[in-house]
């Protein structure tokens, strides 16, 4: 098909030698096309132009991708050709870096429908360098942890040299859609949750006396939890006194939090303290009753299967223990009068 | 790893009921949503009711009405009660979860299948 239609777009890849990166390549089809196309229900019927010029399908992977040979050769399917680029939904993804992605990278509807559909397509110019800047030593990686709970933030790579008063403005994508609020080369997170983990991209021009480019940086965030640095707390039983019946069965129940270990070996156990005797009492398993990605909920009972008087003279201890440290908490048994 | 265990399929009644429940267990993980699909067979899986960690729920078309899914307060457990049961009901019901595990202190994403309970509705 005749490509000199296209809009064109022009992306620079400076990429570390030092480490593994990413890059994507977004099919930034014209609006409408693009809202209708890759992002399915952004225009609800009513909002749909009465003369939409591109009216594809509602298939999110229906774009096609092909890479312009430099030589002049047909336009080459990028799925066949190219085992290191994998295309997701709308977006192209480089998996390894080299200057051998230099190229044209062209963008369109798979489908057809009319003939304002041809020109709808986007010329991606995309020259990948090795960065050569030894001056910056400690950019940012491609790779950046938040830590859950806390604050944190996300650096742009190619920015993370220059102070926030001489930075361009940034534009920031999470996972291909826009931040439209993040214009700095810092996004500040006042709590990290689970969601922030993802692929963002950040973008930013570059203008020369010729031409400008669209310098883009991807950086992988992942959330991370850290060890704990508490004890675990008994969430049950709260009261040191329990009243009870006679002759009737009981049982008690030990609830206790445990919060991340990456080495985890939590203990829950029963222990029955009589004058100066102290024994383990052999109760059913513990089991984790609720969880979270910082902490666990275990639960363990201890069984009588009828209470008697010299049970009433005994202390049921809960003992709780990990790597910090541990807990207990006592229950003294009462009979209920009346 | 965080694995799911489905349980309560059987034979029923056209009219009868069933209640369907799914565990998941594992370590230091939450759980997004949970759903129940179901197959017959040389058909695709379907989506039959889901229900995310906030309690809003969806349905399928055809069960509206019969079906009920509900989870418990740790976010463990789902049933789907299913009641006027037809015998175009009759399939093998999956469950699914959606969430996020810590592995070793990095979150990463899950989505989970159960091994398949069989429901079959006749006379």
């Known amino acids: 098909f005749n490509i000199s239609g296209c809009s064109t777009k022009k992306l620079l890849w400076t990429y570390s030698t030092r480490s593994e990166e990413e890059f994507v390549l977004f099919c930034d089809l014209p609006e409408p096309q693009k809202s209708h196309f890759c992002h399915r229900n952004r225009l609800s019927p009513k909002q749909v132009p009465e003369h939409l010029p591109f009216m594809g399908s509602n298939d999110l992977s229906d774009v096609q991708w092909y890479q312009q040979p430099s030589n002049g050769d047909p336009l080459e399917d990028i799925r066949k050709s190219y085992p290191h680029i994998i295309q997701d939904k709308c977006t192209l993804h480089f998996l390894t870096p080299g200057v051998n992605n230099s190229g044209s990278y062209i963008c369109r509807p798979k489908m057809i429908k009319s003939p304002y559909d041809v020109a709808c397509c986007v010329k991606m110019i995309l020259e990948v360098k090795p960065q050569t800047n030894a001056s910056c030593e400690y950019s940012a990686s491609h790779k950046q942890d938040l830590l859950l709970g806390s604050t944190g933030s996300i650096s742009c790579p190619s920015l993370s040299c220059q102070s926030d008063a001489q930075s361009p403005a940034v534009t920031w994508y999470k996972n291909g859609k826009l931040l439209s609020v993040e214009r700095s080369n810092r996004i500040v997170v006042d709590e990290v949750y689970d969601y922030h983990q993802g692929t963002y991209v950040c973008d930013y021009t570059q203008s020369d006396t010729v031409s400008s480019w669209t310098v883009r940086a991807v950086v992988q965030v992942r959330t991370i939890v850290g060890d704990t640095k508490l004890k675990p707390d008994i969430l049950d039983p709260v009261e040191d006194t329990l009243e009870v019946e006679l002759g009737k069965p009981l049982t008690i129940s030990c609830k206790a939090r445990f919060g991340f270990e990456r080495v985890f070996n939590p203990v829950i156990k029963w222990y029955i303290k009589d004058s100066d005797l102290e024994w383990e009492v052999s109760v059913p398993e513990a089991k984790s009753i609720k969880s979270t990605l910082k902490d666990e909920i275990i639960e363990r009972n201890i069984i009588l299967e009828k209470v008697t008087q010299r049970d009433l003279r005994r202390k049921f201890v809960c003992f709780v223990q990990n790597s910090i440290g541990n807990t207990t908490q006592s229950v003294q048994l009462k009979e209920k009068r009346g | 790893d965080v694995q799911l265990q489905e349980s309560g399929g059987g034979l029923v009644q056209p009219g009868g009921s069933l209640r369907l429940s799914c565990a998941a267990s594992?370590?230091?993980?939450?759980?997004?949503?949970m759903g129940w699909y179901r197959q017959t067979p040389g058909k695709q899986r379907e989506l039959v009711a889901a229900?995310?960690?906030?309690?809003?729920?969806t349905y399928q078309d055809s069960v509206k009405g019969r079906f009920t899914i509900s989870r418990d307060n740790a976010n463990r457990t789902a049933n789907l009660y299913m009641n006027s049961l037809k015998s175009e009901d009759t399939a093998v019901y999956y469950c699914n979860a959606d969430g996020r595990f810590n592995d070793n202190g990095y979150v990463k994403n899950f989505n989970i299948w159960g091994q398949g309970t069989q429901v079959t509705v006749s006379s």
């Open positions: 229900i995310t960690s906030d309690g809003s729920t």
């Open positions: 594992g370590r230091f993980f939450t759980i997004n949503a």
